[in-house]
């Protein structure tokens, strides 16, 4: 049966026993800035082009053992959430991956900047259709990272990022705090904000909307047919990147402002239990859970 | 995220270093009264001192970025410091990434075309 997260983002009239918009997002290229990925996993084979871009710091610790499946874990799962054949949102989207996070899931602002610059140069050399950039990472507030995101957004690129998993104000983190970026918090099957250990999803006025981000089934790098459940605002951001890809594939001329407006318009309203947020943040945090548009664009979204 | 509101720095640290009038022999001194700023991550464990993104003013050309980077290296060498230019940015933001001692920040902030300098910091998978 359909995983809870795909059911949650699917308009009611499409909730059959399976989620299958077979060509969703086919006109859009989604760039993923993350760890290395297992690009020939059955769930994503042929859908992800691994670019030759790599800019990562060395792993911490003298006894660190680099295990390929662990190195690929985060990125493979997210690629599966965006475009996986069986558990993906935008099953028609093609992806390009850039490695900016090392085997411990750590990167640098500078490496991310160079990755964003690589995307801009690729766009200039070979203009294609609409571009979505997924940044499933967060660091402290960074003026330069936010500035780079702003420039890329002004070049017509849609950037989607994780709000962060620090149970804190997203405005204190980057790229979550960049106004031009679509910043995504995480909710669970009960429409509760996601708790992650002692922490959880970030919140506040720098968050644009929430999306499923707990117990999300996706491709596992443990084997070529394996699936695994992962949680976090990265998974939530991947859902919104997939939804954005489908919207842009249906309406390639959408501006960032129009896309943002549509994402908000089609979201489920006031379903999140706000008691989880600090009192002073409740009014600032959007009570929106991302969803695909309903039947108005049946022929476009579900070809 | 969340367009339409003022950008807020939170507890982001900003060091504003006023430019001195004596210019260390620079041909292209900045306009009078402008200040370049230094920024670093407010979360100390995430800081990566020793690597800095030098961001130049918006209309700076690639050739000027390269020239500014070389100038920094030359001035640092005169003071006995080794520096390494790791990357020259163009396409999104003009500037360069440099590996150098923090002692050279004041010098770097006085370079022509410099808008601000940010110390590198860590980002993490979420």
């Amino acid at each position: 049966s359909i995983p809870w997260n795909l059911e949650r983002i699917t308009p009611p009239r499409y909730r059959a026993d399976e989620y299958q918009p077979p060509d969703g997002g086919s006109l859009v290229e989604v760039y993923l800035l993350d760890t290395s990925i297992q690009s020939d996993h059955r769930e994503i084979e042929g859908r992800v082009m691994v670019t030759d871009f790599e800019n990562v710091p060395e792993e911490d610790g003298t006894r660190f053992h680099r295990q390929a499946s662990k190195c690929d874990s985060h990125g493979t799962h997210l690629a599966g959430v965006v475009s996986g054949r069986d558990a993906g949102v935008a099953k028609g989207a093609s992806m390009r991956s850039l490695r900016v996070l090392n085997c411990q899931g750590k990167g640098t602002v500078s490496g991310t900047l160079i990755g964003l610059e690589f995307i801009r140069k690729s766009q200039l050399v070979q203009p294609v259709g609409p571009l979505v950039v997924l940044l499933p990472l967060a660091g402290g507030y960074s003026r330069v990272l936010n500035a780079a995101c702003q420039r890329l957004a002004r070049a017509g690129v849609v950037l989607v990022t994780a709000a962060g998993n620090f149970r804190d104000d997203a405005c204190l983190y980057s790229p979550a705090s960049a106004p031009e970026v679509i910043t995504v918090g995480a909710t669970n099957a009960q429409d509760q904000p996601v708790t992650l250990g002692t922490l959880g999803t970030n919140f506040g006025r720098c968050v644009d909307l929430f999306a499923p981000g707990e117990d999300i089934i996706g491709a596992s790098s443990d084997c070529s047919t394996c699936f695994v459940s992962q949680s976090g605002t990265s998974q939530a951001a991947a859902h919104v990147a997939g939804i954005a890809a489908m919207m842009l594939s249906a309406e390639p001329e959408l501006t960032l402002a129009e896309l943002r407006q549509r994402l908000i318009h089609f979201s489920a309203k006031d379903v999140i239990n706000e008691a989880w947020f600090p009192e002073d943040q409740r009014v600032l945090t959007p009570n929106l859970v991302a969803a695909l548009p309903p039947s108005t664009h049946e022929n476009l979204y579900f070809q | 995220g969340a367009m339409g509101q003022e950008d807020e720095d939170g507890d982001y640290e900003e060091l504003v270093l006023a430019l001195r009038s004596e210019e260390d022999g620079l041909a292209e001194a900045p306009e009078h009264g402008t200040t370049a700023t230094f920024h670093r991550c407010a979360k100390d464990p995430w800081r990566l001192p020793g690597t800095y993104v030098v961001v130049l003013k918006e209309e700076t050309h690639l050739s000027q970025s390269e020239r500014t980077a070389r100038r920094l290296q030359a001035q640092a060498a005169r003071r006995g410091y080794l520096t390494k230019i790791l990357h020259v940015f163009h396409g999104l933001l003009p500037g360069f990434l440099v590996k150098m001692s923090g002692d050279l920040l004041e010098l770097a902030l006085k370079l022509p075309h410099v808008d601000y300098i940010e110390e590198d910091s860590s980002v993490f998978a979420q």
Epitope: S39, D40, R42, E45, G46, M49, V50, R85, D86 | -
Partner: antibody, heavy 115, light 109 residues
């Protein structure tokens, strides 16, 4: 264009081993693994397993597990399928195909097991 | 015995439409979006005609279409032509492997 080119026909005695090669070209190798499928005379298709060009990982069908070994040589973009302890019912045309989706196929290699 | 069940043979006259079924279980056809159909002419390798239930690779005629309901997938060929005479195989993912149907011989009368 995307191509998979296989090695030539083989005749083997029962108990022997056979090694079939498949050279891939015309696409980004790491985006797909290679599946091996066989077809006995007048019969249907049987999936034997898969190997990754990315990291060399394998996934073998239960029926041939223990007798089959798939390997890659990334320097020559070639995949090998070795089948040991051959029996007469291993007589078949052996195909390599691109990925699990099997969207492109090699021309086939006839393996005859006969005493 | 194959994991997926197909009729051994079907036939139709030129211009007609025919449908070939492929029945599995919730662990294969019913559980995945990845049902494929292959055409094989004698002495040739199989050729992919439909992937992921209903998608056609470029170069494949629009006369070929695929669908799925529950544990059964179907291949429909409309406007039957002489060159469609061939064997047709379905395949599906399982949790760890791939399975094929036994094949259907299509005769164009």
């Amino acid at each position: 264009q995307v191509q998979l080119v296989q090695s030539g026909a083989e005749v083997k005695k029962p108990g022997a081993s056979v090694k079939v090669s498949c050279k891939a070209s015309g696409y980004t190798l790491t985006s797909y693994g290679i599946s091996w499928v066989r077809q006995a005379p007048g019969q249907g298709l049987e999936w034997m397993g898969w190997i990754s060009f990315y990291n060399g990982n394998t996934n073998y069908a239960q029926k041939v597990q223990g007798r089959v070994t798939m390997t890659t040589d990334t320097s020559t973009s070639t995949v090998y399928m070795e089948l040991r302890s051959l029996r007469s019912d291993d007589t078949a045309v052996y195909y390599c195909a691109r990925g699990y989706g099997m969207d492109v196929w090699g021309q086939g290699t006839t393996v005859t097991v006969s005493s | 015995q194959s994991a997926l069940t197909q009729p051994a043979s079907v036939s139709g006259s030129p211009g007609q439409s025919i449908t070939i079924s492929c029945t599995g279980t919730s662990s294969d056809v019913g559980g995945y979006n990845s049902v494929s159909w292959y055409q094989q002419h004698p002495g040739k390798p199989p050729k992919l005609m439909i992937y992921e239930v209903s998608n056609r690779p470029s170069g494949v005629s629009i006369r070929f279409s695929g669908s799925k309901s529950g544990n059964t997938a179907s291949l429909t060929i409309s406007g039957l032509q002489a060159e469609d005479e061939a064997d047709y195989f379905c395949s599906s993912y399982t949790s760890t492997s791939m399975v094929f149907g036994g094949g259907t011989k299509l005769t164009v009368l």
